[in-house]
């Protein structure tokens, strides 16, 4: 899977989208993880609701909901109040009995919000610093990764 | 029990190469990434590079392209780095160590790292 | 590279003290900054990864914070055990890179 860059700004809200295949996930209850470490495990943050017909209804678990459009083949996380700690690697998931088809890689990078001067020197301001090797980030916006681009170097 | 066992201390003379082993147990090395960290004497860490075993993708500090090649057998779990045209500053502690890549591990294993003397 | 800058680079504290340590980088690193702990003869020790978040079975008198280009490192009440070098390292970028290490010692 190729990474998707979604760039939010700090305090504000970032809705990251995660189309797929209607048909072939038909019936399948979706979910969104947080990847701990590139190899590591994902942990579940929140699940669209435990009844697939009401997968429409928006479910939060604290600032992240998710929501689906089961017809359009779209799943959609909002992340409220983003903050630096929300940075890293998610995955947007469909679930099958106890196994999970990963729909879609996401990184979320967080933003200075340009308004705040308060915390000025804590957040990265777009244009300020380039944070991949050979590659354009078009900010407040997302991306793809290109095939087997690296965005950051693997650490812990 | 996980742990990263290397080889033993080396001593060579300028201008040869050496080669530092690094088996890992209790896990598998494919699920990992392996890097390489050294230290001289009563100095700091120095990151040299990494390689994902998996992919048998590599990657290396500018500092140490060209003369470090780090490779990885799967089938032994066994990580290897390889420095050549060794000189008197390349004497160190080299260390493997193995995470779970970026955007926040929560698995950091270290081998307990080899020293390599350098002297003519 | 990125260059990471810590301070002190030593200090002398007593058991119960609270020591503080700092670590600049020379460009945003978001929270990608991970706190070491290295005792001499021994590999380094994984304390805090993400900036702030405490590894497993680290003591809780440990905490970071900080994001961006400035972070710190907390010893809330140091024990005997906490006499050590302390580095921080960057992984934003290529090469990863290490403070140079700040080294606590007994008072």
């Known amino acids: 899977h190729n990474t998707t860059v979604f760039q939010g700004v700090a305090g504000q809200s970032l809705q990251v989208s995660c189309p797929y295949d209607s048909m072939k996930h038909w019936g399948r209850r979706k979910a969104w993880c947080r990847q701990l470490g590139e190899k590591g495990p994902c942990q579940r943050v929140v699940s669209t609701h435990n009844l697939w017909l009401l997968s429409f209804l928006r479910r939060w678990n604290g600032s992240t909901a998710i929501t689906d459009d089961t017809l359009g083949g779209t799943l959609t996380i909002t992340l409220r109040n983003l903050q630096p700690h929300d940075a890293g690697l998610y995955q947007c998931q469909s679930l099958h009995g106890s196994e999970a088809d990963t729909l879609r890689k996401v990184l979320v990078e967080v933003l200075a919000d340009p308004l705040d001067h308060r915390d000025a020197g804590d957040l990265w301001f777009p244009g300020e610093s380039e944070s991949f090797e050979d590659a354009h980030v078009e900010h407040s916006i997302s991306r793809s990764l290109l095939e087997g681009e690296i965005p950051f170097p693997p650490t812990s | 029990q996980v742990q990263l066992v290397q080889s033993g201390a080396e001593v060579k003379k300028p201008g040869a190469s050496v080669k530092v082993s690094c088996k890992a147990s209790g896990f598998s090395i494919e699920d990992f990434y392996i890097h390489w960290v050294r230290q001289a004497p009563g100095q700091g860490l120095e990151w040299m590079g990494w390689?994902?075993?998996?992919?048998?993708?590599?990657k290396y500090a500018p500092k140490f392209q060209g003369r470090v090649t780090i490779t990885a057998d799967t089938s032994t779990s066994t990580a290897y780095m390889e420095l050549s045209s060794l000189r008197s500053e390349d004497t160190a502690v080299y260390y493997c160590?193995?995470?779970?890549?970026?955007?926040?591990?929560?698995?950091?294993?270290w081998g307990q790292g080899t020293l390599v003397t350098v002297s003519s | 590279d990125i260059q990471m800058t810590q301070s002190p680079s030593s200090l002398s504290a007593s058991v119960g003290d609270r020591v503080t340590i700092t670590c600049h980088a020379s460009q945003h690193i978001n929270v990608w900054l991970s706190w070491y702990q290295q005792k001499p003869g021994k590999a380094p020790k994984l304390l805090i990864y993400?900036?702030?978040n405490l590894h497993t079975g680290v003591p809780s008198r440990f905490s970071g914070s900080g994001s961006g280009t400035d972070f710190t490192l907390t010893i809330s009440s140091l024990q005997p055990e906490d006499f050590a070098t302390y580095y921080c390292q960057q992984g934003q970028t290529y090469p990863r890179t290490f403070g140079q290490g700040t080294k606590v010692e007994i008072k």
């Open positions: 390689i994902d075993p998996e992919q048998g993708d590599s």
């Open positions: 993400k900036a702030s």
């Open positions: 160590h193995a995470d779970h890549g970026n955007y926040g591990s929560t698995m950091d294993y």
